[in-house]
Structure formats: structure tokens, C-alpha cells
């Protein structure tokens, strides 16, 4: 959890002298309480949107827009504290608007934005806009709080985010498998353009339990340089018992960027439909699974209207 | 100090309802989101709940979700845990715990104990 | 969601024996990891978390290390006050799940 530092964020606008500034959390009304103090923020809303660094890299921010309610507590407002909490580290990081000017009543309400909190892929943050000061400890509320939910780095925008890409995002090895004769099962998969080893993992399952009845591991060397993009095999011996047919494949790279912690891709062969009309012929319908680093949601947002990723969970 | 306290646990029938409390103190209470984590007896922990500091986010384990409401007042100071429709499988030891920041749980209450039978 | 798995279940160990406890992830879960210890009916304590930081307080004879699916804590040199239940958990996402737990014992 970081802020961007460029461009310089701004919270001054026409009517208002406003400046940014870190905030340790704890604005000095909350040990020195005043009598008067203004109401909560109103529609807050986050939105997912991108922001690039001067260094040309590409993140996703937290974008933050409330507006005032329409009445006279705005002449006691002096600010406002921003605070984004990401729920599993339970890091924070807060900064103040400072008012330098009083707030008038003017023709349209008053709309403040924030674009500089970076978030991470796959997090969950609570985002929080305190009007300052705040209130005296019995008095009423005058904060909003909202959830944000980043989306991993399957979401079609935040796939050539600089984080994501760090992790092999761009990667698409197409993974195809099928089973041959002798209880043997072909995994194919497309190599990426760099000299780095890979790993697949095979592991199966009874067709009725999800406990792993059957594990290997191979080993893929590094590929050289004219064999980038081309297609790797692996054969894998199965599991002799035939109802040990449920495989789960996944193909981990080893790039420089992410070493132990790049995105693995995944397929799964279900146990083959026995009926009396069908001869067993090699499976070619297998599920297609995208494994990020943890469990994902489907997704829409303001930069990528209509159009929703599904993730099969298994 | 920093100190974590639960209570509320007891006995109770299959069906039946109990509320947890966890009373925090040492600490500023209204910036940490908190935890409820459970240990049946003789086995491993089980991760329960979790309500961030102002309570716009809330999630709950499998086994207790739409059984069990987590909720937090951050004017006392105090951590809940409503639990509805107790089952034999709810018997456990119920700790709160304070997540650490950077990750992992670093402050936890003694537990408070749970018995669901008839 | 994912799986959280430990190994061994249970392992006994003289005194200043080197051990070592693995908990693997079903998904990769970058270093979103902790350890913990715990004593017979006692609550348990941090010992490790983002997968290889001691937190304070901890014995630099713990150590951990590890990302994405497979990590490891290891004693240098057991002693008999660790003699406890070990527990990996991971907080990349909700639901924070716990491994099942390895009991180490003393020879």
C-alpha cells in the first residue's frame, strides 16, 4: 500500500485553496475535541482505475469521489482525512486534505477526487473519508466507509499492469492434453520468450472424493532461445487404479520477474463418462482453469464496461 | 497493556443461541480489523470471521455463514459474535485475535468455551 | 477456495536436532503466510509472518521461508520448550485458512 508520487496530487479547486498532505491517521481533533463539527460524507464512491509512474510503469489505483451534504455544517468543515485499510495485512495509509480557505455555498455541490492510493492486485481494502474534525467521542459519525474489492490479474485491464505483468501475466500457454494409450496422459503447453524453467504438476483425484489419489511433478530445463514459443510436451504415467481418473494439471514458470510466485495455469481432465454406446476415445474436452494467486470474482468496472470474466473454481 | 478478553461462552442445545463479546484494551481498538478463531477440542484451529474497522467489510468461514453475525463498537471498545442455530459440530474454544500489521494474528484473548449438546 | 496442507502431521526430535515443518497452498498465495505456535491449552502465538519475518520476541533459532505454494518452518536447534502444536495459515484472501497442524515432540 504506497501512494503515487507524480504527478503531485491537487485538491484545490475553483472556490477552495486546498493542499494534500501524509497523514499519521490520527488528526489532532480526535485528543483535542471540538464543539462544532460537520456531517458525514456524502456517495462515497471507489472506482478501479490506472495511473502510470514516471518510470512509464502502469498501476492500478484506488480512484475515491464523495460529495458534501447541503447543509451549514460545511462552514465548520476544515478537511477531510482519507484512510485506505487493506484487510489482510492490516496496513494503513491516510492522507489529509487541508483546508486553506472556508467552503462557501455555491450553485452545484461540492465533489472532491482522489487517484494516489496504489492498490495491489487481488486485495481487499476498506476505504474510509472522515470529514475533519471529527466528532467529539458521543457525537454522531461523521465518516463513510466502503469496501474495494481489486480484481486479480485475469481482469482484462489489469493484466498489462505493471504488477501483473511481473508475474507473467502475458503468458498464455494454450495448455492442451490428452490421454494415450497405457495409462499415459500428453500435457502440451506454449513456451514463453525467456530462458526459465519450468514445472508441471499433475495430481489426481477419485471421481466421487476430492482427495488426491495420485501426485507427480516433472521438470521442464530452460528452453533456448529458438525454442521460445514453440510447444513443450510432457508424458505423464497415470495411476494404475482406474478410478483414480480426475487429473488436475497445472504449469508453473520459473521467469525472472516472479522466481517461486509467477501465475500457473491449470487444466483439469474430468473421469471419462462410461456409457454402453460410447468407446473411450482420448479426452479432448477438457476445462480450461487460469490459476492466479488466489481465489477471484467476476468483475466489471468503469474502464472495461460489459464485459465480465468468469473464473471456473474446482 | 495490550489485552483481549472474551466471554459469553456456555452451554447450550443444538438450535440454541449464544453471544460472544471480546472487551479490547491497550490499543487503539477503532484501527485494527479483528478475528474470530476457534479450536475444537483435541483439534486444529479454524478461522471463523473477520469485520474490518468500520465494518464495511465481513467475511465468515463455510461452516458458520448466514449461522453466525460478527459486529464491532468501536465507542466501547468491543468485539461480538452473534451465533444462531448452534450445532455439536460448534463446540470449541472461541478466541479473538488482533491481526498484526504486515500479516499473521499477533494478540489473541484466552478463549472463551463453547459447548453445543443436548 | 484454497487448501492448506502440512507435513508431517507429527514428528519427535531429540534436543538440538534441526526440524523442519512444510505447509503447502493449493493455489500460490505469494508470501501471505504465517506460523504459529501453540502449547498445550494455551492460545497460540505469531511466530513468523509474510513467510520468512521473525516477529518480535520469537527465537532466532525459527526461521521461515518459502513463496507462493510451498513454505517452510524450520527450528535450528530444537529445544525442549518447543515442544507444541504448529500451525501455517494464509491471509492473501478471505477465508484466512489454517493448515492442520504438526505436533512436534522431544525424543
Known amino acids: 500500500l504506497r501512494l503515487l508520487d507524480f504527478p503531485a496530487p491537487v485538491c484545490a479547486q475553483e472556490g477552495l485553496s486546498c493542499r494534500v498532505k501524509n497523514s499519521t491517521c490520527l488528526d489532532d481533533s480526535w485528543i483535542h475535541p471540538r464543539n462544532l463539527t460537520p456531517s458525514s460524507p456524502k456517495d462515497l464512491q471507489i472506482q478501479l482505475h490506472f495511473a502510470h509512474t514516471q518510470q512509464g510503469d502502469l498501476f492500478p489505483v484506488a480512484h475515491i469521489e464523495w460529495t458534501l451534504q447541503t447543509d451549514a455544517s460545511i462552514l465548520y468543515l476544515e478537511g477531510a482525512e482519507l484512510s485506505v485499510l487493506q484487510l489482510n495485512t492490516n496496513e494503513r495509509l491516510c492522507v489529509r486534505f487541508e483546508f486553506l480557505s472556508k467552503l462557501r455555498h455555491h450553485h452545484r455541490r461540492w465533489r472532491f477526487t482522489f487517484s494516489h492510493f496504489v492498490v495491489d492486485p487481488d486485495q481487499e481494502y476498506e476505504v474510509t473519508v472522515h470529514h475533519l474534525p471529527k466528532p467529539i467521542p458521543d457525537g454522531d459519525p461523521n465518516h463513510q466507509s466502503k469496501n474495494f474489492l481489486v480484481p486479480d490479474c485475469e481482469h482484462a485491464r489489469m493484466k498489462v499492469t505493471t504488477p501483473c505483468m511481473s508475474s507473467g501475466s502475458l503468458w498464455d500457454p494454450n495448455i492442451t492434453v490428452e490421454t494415450l494409450e497405457a495409462h499415459q496422459l500428453r500435457v502440451s503447453f506454449t513456451l514463453w520468450n525467456e530462458s526459465t524453467p519450468y514445472q508441471v504438476l499433475l495430481e489426481s483425484f477419485s471421481d466421487s472424493e476430492n482427495h488426491s489419489c495420485f501426485d507427480v511433478v516433472k521438470q521442464i530445463f530452460a528452453p533456448r532461445q529458438e525454442e521460445f514459443h514453440q510447444r513443450a510436451n510432457v508424458t505423464f504415467t497415470l495411476s494404475k487404479f482406474h478410478w483414480c481418473c480426475h487429473h488436475h494439471v497445472q504449469v508453473q514458470p520459473f521467469f525472472s520477474s516472479c522466481l517461486n510466485d509467477c501465475l500457473r495455469h491449470a487444466v483439469t481432465v474430468p473421469c471419462p463418462v462410461i456409457s454402453n454406446t460410447t468407446v473411450p476415445k482420448p479426452v479432448a474436452d477438457y476445462i480450461p482453469l487460469w490459476e492466479p494467486r488466489s481465489g477471484s470474482s467476476d468483475y466489471k468496472d468503469d474502464d472495461d464496461k460489459g464485459s465480465s470474466h468468469h473464473h471456473h473454481h474446482h | 497493556e495490550v489485552q483481549l478478553v472474551e466471554s459469553g461462552g456456555g452451554s447450550v442445545q443444538p438450535g440454541g443461541s449464544l453471544r460472544l463479546s471480546c472487551a479490547a484494551s491497550?490499543?487503539?481498538?477503532?484501527?485494527?480489523?479483528m478475528n474470530w478463531v476457534r479450536q475444537a477440542p483435541g483439534k486444529g484451529l479454524e478461522w471463523v470471521s473477520i469485520?474490518?474497522?468500520?465494518?464495511?467489510?465481513?467475511h465468515y468461514a463455510d461452516s458458520v455463514k448466514g449461522r453466525f453475525t460478527i459486529s464491532r463498537d468501536n465507542a466501547k471498545n468491543s468485539l461480538y459474535l452473534q451465533m444462531n442455530s448452534l450445532r455439536d459440530e460448534d463446540t470449541a474454544v472461541y478466541y479473538c485475535?488482533?491481526?498484526?500489521?504486515?500479516?499473521?494474528?499477533?494478540?489473541w484473548g484466552q478463549g472463551t468455551t463453547v459447548t453445543v449438546s443436548s | 477456495d484454497i487448501q492448506m496442507t502440512q507435513s508431517p502431521s507429527s514428528l519427535s526430535a531429540s534436543v538440538g536436532d534441526r526440524v523442519t515443518i512444510t505447509c503447502r497452498a493449493s493455489q500460490g498465495i505469494s508470501n501471505y503466510l504465517a506460523w504459529y505456535q501453540q502449547k498445550p491449552g494455551k492460545f497460540p502465538e505469531l511466530l513468523i509472518y509474510a513467510a520468512s519475518t521473525l516477529q518480535s520476541g520469537v527465537p532466532s533459532r525459527f526461521s521461515g521461508s518459502g513463496s507462493g505454494t510451498d513454505f517452510t518452518l524450520t527450528i535450528s536447534s530444537l529445544q525442549p520448550e518447543d515442544v507444541a502444536t504448529y500451525y501455517c495459515?494464509?491471509?492473501?484472501?478471505?477465508?484466512?485458512?489454517f493448515g492442520p497442524g504438526t505436533k512436534v515432540d522431544i525424543k
Open positions: 485475535a488482533r491481526p498484526k500489521v504486515g500479516g499473521g494474528m499477533d494478540v
Open positions: 495459515q494464509k491471509y492473501n484472501r478471505a477465508p484466512f485458512t
Open positions: 469485520i474490518s474497522s468500520r465494518s464495511s467489510i465481513i
Open positions: 491497550g490499543f487503539t481498538f477503532s484501527s485494527y480489523s
